[in-house]
Interface confidence: medium
Amino acid sequence: SERCDDWGLDTMRQIQVFEDEPARIKCPLFEHFLKFNYSTAHSAGLTLIWYWTRQDRDLEEPINFRLPENRISKEKDVLWFRPTLLNDTGNYTCMLRNTTYCSKVAFPLEVVQKDSCFNSPMKLPVHKLYIEYGIQRITCPNVDGYFPSSVKPTITWYMGCYKIQNFNNVIPEGMNLSFLIALISNNGNYTCVVTYPENGRTFHLTRTLTVKVVGSPKNAVPPVIHSPNDHVVYEKEPGEELLIPCTVYFSFLMDSRNEVWWTIDGKKPDDITIDVTINESISHSRTEDETRTQILSIKKVTSEDLKRSYVCHARSAKGEVAKAAKVKQKVPAPRYTVELACGFGAT
């Protein structure tokens, strides 16, 4: 057969769907690989062909579109399952071709089982809500295109196993779930079950997402440097190890890059000749506020090193701060026999 542009197995788009539920899967060619859409391709005389490789098999085979009740069908660039079965798991390929052009991509499809509490191996999207921020909403995800706007589905929301009814601060609003006030106790997995009729049959769509309550932008502050500070002086003798922690608190800020770095005499440690190492650790609070600690370490400090300026810097979307460490050379204790004796006027 003639050459075909093969984009390989697109593992970035690992598609997971629940067993015994409808699934509509768009051919990834038009979304991620080609610069034209299905309509353009179709009107140019290109044909979209689907085939698959079953789990643990190497053999590519055509998809059976003649199953009872059209269980698997193709509509434009979408492959439909009404509904899925466990053994539909495998690698699916969509190929766009005519006599002179060919392009194809494969992607993995995993049909997943869930228990009565919606637990499953499904990777869950995370939705972040700001703590104590006022009314916020989450929306039942990935249900577009399953039924026409004329169909009015029923939607039931659950937190874990429990149907959401008269919850303390959570109100179901159809496809939306409203949090009158988000609190840490609202952390958890929320599931919407969308039920709709189609051709005399009833289908269910189950969508679970994780809600994580995070720090509110109303409470966000610029980075706070806890250490170094004015109360601690790093007093060392030459030859000793110098350890200076830079500990910085960052308020949670959506999509903010938190940075901590040291400068020595105004230069980054990498740009200076002294033997310095820096170790970083990061911890998070329950609302995803972040504490970063960078420990600057000089194994055998010299008297030259003890005269240098050590400054901890921190930056977030809220601002940039810096704090110098107080470093000084320890004054050697007087040697009694000589210094003190001289002090008492001994000759």
Partner: antibody, heavy 125, light 113 residues
Framework: QQLEQSGGGAEGGLVKPGGSLELCCKA??????????MCWVRQAPGKGLEWIGC?????????YYASWVNGRFTLSRDIDQSTGCLQLNSLTAADTAMYYC?????????????WGQGTLVTVSS | ALVMTQTPSPVSAAVGGTVTINCQAS??????LAWFQQKPGQPPKLLIY???TLASGVPSRFSGSGSGTEFTLTISGLQSDDAATYYC???????????????FGGGTEVVVK
């Protein structure tokens, strides 16, 4: 987008103490099911606004009442007719008021962007 | 039950002046507060929601601020058409099976001189 109120006749509702009355509110220019909530507020003559309750106008059965309602009033909705109703029972003279329906033109529960024209309910013997 | 206390009432100011109306919630309602304007014989009109977000079509002369239990509506560049009664509405954040409370303040009459 508007809310049209009905119930109690064109001149409003004159009801005897202990009596009942149903007020309804029809959404026109938008689908009630896509606008989520139908809420009710009343206003006694010369007084301020008083929240009665809200009913979700979609597929679930969320209904919330002010604690003072004590089961005397009932909210219902008919999605197909884009209508929400307020059933008033065991009425007393203190229930004499202008009754408004309101729906969120914004956001969902707790917002009242659209209002009906109001229906005056008079409880008198 | 949630109680919303509105002050002062009435309040008067000259055309072009500034009016500030306060609303205090008996519970922490975070930013779940709306402001309404009502003129005689008319239903209320939504001005502000989420404590500070201007509703569609409302002039920027109206502004809201506050969160928690203390809220303020400010009307600057007062116009004669602003003569009306103003109400705050708090959405309480705790729902219990025996009822939830959204509560209006008692109203503030604004007189334009």
């Amino acid at each position: 987008q508007q809310l049209e109120q009905s119930g109690g006749g064109a001149e409003g509702g004159l009801v005897k103490p202990g009596g009942s009355l149903e007020l309804c509110c029809k959404a026109s220019g938008f689908s009630l099911s896509s606008n989520y909530w139908m809420c009710w507020v009343r206003q006694a003559p010369g007084k301020g606004l008083e929240w009665i309750g809200c009913i979700y106008a979609g597929s679930s059965d969320s209904t919330y009442y002010a604690s003072w309602v004590n089961g005397r009033f009932t909210l219902s909705r008919d999605i197909d007719q884009s209508t929400g109703c307020l059933q008033l029972n065991s009425l007393t003279a203190a229930d004499t008021a202008m009754y408004y329906c309101a729906s969120p033109g914004y956001g969902g529960y707790g917002y009242y962007g659209l209002w009906g024209q109001g229906t005056l309910v008079t409880v008198s013997s | 039950a949630l109680v919303m206390t509105q002050t002062p009432s009435p309040v008067s100011a000259a055309v072009g002046g500034t009016v500030t109306i306060n609303c205090q919630a008996s519970e922490d309602i975070y930013s779940n507060l709306a402001w309404f304007q009502q003129k005689p014989g008319q239903p209320p009109k939504l001005l502000i929601y989420d404590a500070s977000t201007l509703a569609s079509g409302v002039p920027s002369r109206f502004s809201g601020s506050g969160s928690g239990t203390e809220f303020t509506l400010t009307i600057s560049g007062l116009q004669s058409d602003d003569a009306a009664t103003y109400y705050c509405l708090g959405v309480y954040t705790y729902i219990s099976p025996d009822g939830t409370d959204n509560a209006f303040g008692g109203g503030t009459e604004v007189v334009v001189k």
